[in-house]
Amino acid sequence: SGTTNTVAAYNLTWKSTNFKTILEWEPKPVNQVYTVQISTKSGDWKSKCFYTTDTECDLTDEIVKDVKQTYLARVFSYPAGNVESTGSAGEPLYENSPEFTPYLETNLGQPTIQSFEQVGTKVNVTVEDERTLVRRNNTFLSLRDVFGKDLIYTLYYWKSSSSGKKTAKTNTNEFLIDVDKGENYCFSVQAVIPSRTVNRKSTDSPVECMGQEKGEFREI
């Protein structure tokens, strides 16, 4: 129940990539505004995005405090210009979000191949260690800092002249693979958290090929 001129938010959805986390909902407001609250299961409610006409709220600053916690958010609806108004039950209309555990659920962002270097028949491929918005001791942590060995990378590599993709895996950010001498190869990487049951894989990195400026070739 609520006042006759407000409607409850619905379709509350968490959108999160590399811990950048936004709560989205519907409907677009007509003569109403929204305020969001977030809490952990055992914590107090904290208000964010006060009296907004947006249908999203950036909750990154709250969830990065402890990415392994489970969070719940709720969206309150108020009549525009009369935010003190409450529903018949004595409180504004609100809707709860699904629970959200950032460590288990944030999408893995598209990785980037930082460099590759060929030495003879070996190629060393390095994946950029992307910075997240998770802080420790006033510094931003990388994806590897946050996930540790839970995070692996899968490398796809193939001869420029063929289509079949070989794979290699690493729990660091570096691969050392064997290649055929005199052949040009292309590379793409995918971030994976195997211990998850959903959101296990990132999208593929942009493809990088030998003979382009990102790599380095050394004949030994």
Epitope: Q190, T197, V198, R200
Partner: antibody
Framework: EVQLVESGGGLVQPGGSLRLSCAAS????????IHWVRQAPGKGLEWVGY????????YYADSVKGRFTISADTSKNTAYLQMNSLRAEDTAVYYC?????????????WGQGTLVTVSS | DIQMTQSPSSLSASVGDRVTITCRAS??????VAWYQQKPGKAPKLLIY???FLYSGVPSRFSGSRSGTDFTLTISSLQPEDFATYYC?????????FGQGTKVEIK
Amino acid sequence: EVQLVESGGGLVQPGGSLRLSCAASGFTISDYWIHWVRQAPGKGLEWVGYIDPQNGWTYYADSVKGRFTISADTSKNTAYLQMNSLRAEDTAVYYCARDYGSLTINLDYWGQGTLVTVSS
Amino acid sequence: DIQMTQSPSSLSASVGDRVTITCRASQDVNTAVAWYQQKPGKAPKLLIYSASFLYSGVPSRFSGSRSGTDFTLTISSLQPEDFATYYCQQHYTTPPTFGQGTKVEIK
């Protein structure tokens, strides 16, 4: 419960074609990789190929390259093995298996298999 | 491609026996080796992963070890349900490859 169910096997003449299906339940195939492995009667296991259903990328054993094609329909949570130009030596039980995708665990769940017989 | 050479191809043993099966990789595969058990008419089942880790639900009489490129599957005390064929497999590089199999039969 994780399950893989193959279907589509049967008797086919040399030079013919067959499409096998691998229907997955209990997990989303785009979060994993799917492999096909075959076993000729009385013989050992032979890896055929894999697909990453998320991007459609594949790799095949030399023995089937150019004749077999692995594909996936993520909306149906199903992988396929299209077999063309079949030969007598392709006669086998064909299994699909899920690749867990870690450094440590590879093929953790297998289907029950479907028999393909190539004979005139 | 990496070859996995498995031995013996078959062995006869009695219930309660200690059984050892070995696999040699043709080049370094780190610990990316799995062992599977297969019974007639059934799909293979994962027993050991990463050379020495027991997969969930597998009895503790099964164990795996690694020494360089040599990998061993040991059944400490053979049970009636263990009579089957066992395969090693490397997944260090593409294509993954299997050993030829070891059939464990009743003596």
